[in-house]
Interface confidence: low
Amino acid sequence: EMGTADLGPSSVPTPTNVTIESYNMNPIVYWEYQIMPQVPVFTVEVKNYGVKNSEWIDACINISHHYCNISDHVGDPSNSLWVRVKARVGQKESAYAKSEEFAVCRDGKIGPPKLDIRKEEKQIMIDIFHPSVFVNGDEQEVDYDPETTCYIRVYNVYVRMNGSEIQYKILTQKEDDCDEIQCQLAIPVSSLNSQYCVSAEGVLHVWGVTTEKSKEVCITIFNSSIKG
């Protein structure tokens, strides 16, 4: 087996393909590395844009796997961050490999809102529950929040009735329609036998990124009776 003494001064390869993926505001860094005779360890550092005296902060130190969860090191999810990764084999270190610029709110994915549908008197009530995300280990809803610039500012609600589709918009800042848990939409029911199918997606401030679209939920009205 080759020892570190056999490695030349710049012969520790640099990690490649440093990428960041984020789902529900939980960003994880991935990278690739060639097979080495000795097990390499990796250090991952994060730099946040917009932080005073912004410096590279250690996120994962001397790890042997090829991923690192950096969610504890993200400031404002609307702001950009960069990641760099270096490898160490024995006492020798590689150069840093840098990621592209990444903003959790702009470049990440957020799961769909959850929907509930029911009939109340002469209307159908649709409950749209905000997607849950994890911020610094805490579960939070992506509802309107004056403390952050990353929140759902509008829901696009798609209502299909007997084949034709209507799109509604709900502004999350309207307190009549929304609270910290959910938004509500009321749709008048026609007197005809009808099937209503509803799906929804959130649109995030600042850049209008959409969440994943919810699964369609349906309700059928038969002569003022309900069949779910």
Partner: nanobody
């Protein structure tokens, strides 16, 4: 890559006018609010004024009556019209995309224009 690109600026005499523009590389229709900031030499960056998605504007006292912010959603562009310029308006001007809180305060995001220098001097 989303970018805010600024145009305009330059040297103008006291009492003169200048218009700055900020072009966004995507639709600004869904952006809650946009703002102009300025940074005088050796000073920190300060808010000049804001415009919300429905066109509502707000200005700091030093800009009221002289500066006007407008937006053209079709062109994805925000403008800062500056009239009756004074030497103390000399600064680098920046545009920003952000949000307005329920209390009416502006919250900048990390998305800034590159800055454009305005010099007011005779």
């Amino acid at each position: 890559q989303v970018q805010l690109q600024q145009f305009g600026g330059g040297l103008v005499q006291p009492g003169g006018s200048l218009r700055l523009s900020c072009a966004v590389s995507r639709s600004i229709f869904s952006i809650d609010a946009m703002a102009w900031y300025r940074q005088a030499p050796g000073k920190q960056r300060n808010l000049v004024g804001t415009i919300t998605s429905d066109g509502t504007t707000n200005y700091v006292d030093s800009a009221k009556g002289r500066f006007t912010i407008s937006r053209d959603n079709a062109k994805n562009t925000v403008y800062l019209q500056m009239n009756s310029l004074k030497p103390e308006d000399t600064a680098v001007y920046f545009c920003n995309a952000g949000a307005v809180s329920r209390t009416g305060g502006y919250r900048p995001s990390g998305y800034w224009g590159q800055g454009t220098l305005v010099t007011v001097s005779s």
